[in-house]
């Protein structure tokens, strides 16, 4: 099958890093500078991505693979292949159209990206709040209020130690 295919389409023999050059009677030609083909059988080489401005180069372009970008400090990647860079905020904030804003009461964000999320509602699980939430941290839920009522402890205290040979007083 491979042999049949290559007889029908000479371009199928062109390896990665080359393209099938119509200007040269469909012979394989190496990709021109600053372009690449990552698979065989390509009819053109793609222009290398350039990481400019808020983007910085994570991996240089080669004749067989595109450049990879990430974001400069203070920004983070969004989208497939880091197609966008979004401004970081502090923990306890979220990015809005007007910039970084503190989380509203009852919400938190423990990262430099993303949105503020509501504190966990401990009572939905029948638990109580052990540690209060902040803008940066979620609440910590503890045992249920019933578990904390006097005489209802689930942990049985150890019996008092007795010396051998003595009867209890």
């Amino acid at each position: 099958f491979e042999r049949t295919r290559s007889l029908q389409d000479p371009c199928s023999n062109c390896p990665a890093g080359t393209f099938c050059d119509n200007n040269r009677n469909q012979i394989c030609s190496p990709c021109p500078p600053n372009s690449f083909s990552s698979a065989g059988g390509q009819r053109t080489c793609d222009i290398c991505r350039q990481c400019k401005g808020v983007f910085r180069t994570r991996k240089e372009c080669s004749s067989t693979s595109n450049a990879e970008c990430d974001c400069t400090p203070g920004f983070h990647c969004l989208g497939a292949g880091c197609s966008m860079c979004e401004q970081d905020c502090k923990q306890g904030q979220e990015l809005t159209k007007k910039g970084c804003k503190d989380c509203c009461f009852g919400t938190f964000n423990d990262q430099k990206r993303g949105i503020c999320r509501p504190w966990t509602n401990c009572s939905l699980d029948g638990k109580s709040v052990l540690v209060n939430g902040t803008k940066e941290r979620d609440v910590v839920c503890g045992p249920s209020p019933a578990d904390l009522s006097p005489g209802a402890s689930s942990v049985t205290p150890p019996a008092p130690a007795r010396e051998p040979g003595h009867s209890p007083q």
């Epitope: 190496p30 990709c31 080669s62 004749s63």
Partner: nanobody, 111 residues
Framework: AVQLVESGGGLVQPGGSLRLSCAAS????????WSWYRQAPGKQRELVAW???????HYTDSAKGRFAISRDNTKKTLYLQMNSLKLEDTAVYYC?????WGQGTQVTVSS
Amino acid sequence: AVQLVESGGGLVQPGGSLRLSCAASGNIFSIRVWSWYRQAPGKQRELVAWFAWDNIAHYTDSAKGRFAISRDNTKKTLYLQMNSLKLEDTAVYYCNSEDSWGQGTQVTVSS
């Protein structure tokens, strides 16, 4: 324009070796892609080995493991070391620098 002149071809037995040279003259300093092609009788010209613009050497399947491309920038010369030659390596071998071609050098592998 760049002028290219190949040399080093000849008659060799199967399993033998040859080293082709391609001497370049003219303004070669802006050229970043250097290649060796070959054309067997009655067949289309085909790529054999090349230095890509990122300075990495590449080979087509027919050349992998047997041929080695190299260059000497001070001598403005591109080389193709060909080992373990086979009958099917018989062809005219051409040097290419982006838009310029040499006149070719004949390689004949025959017992």
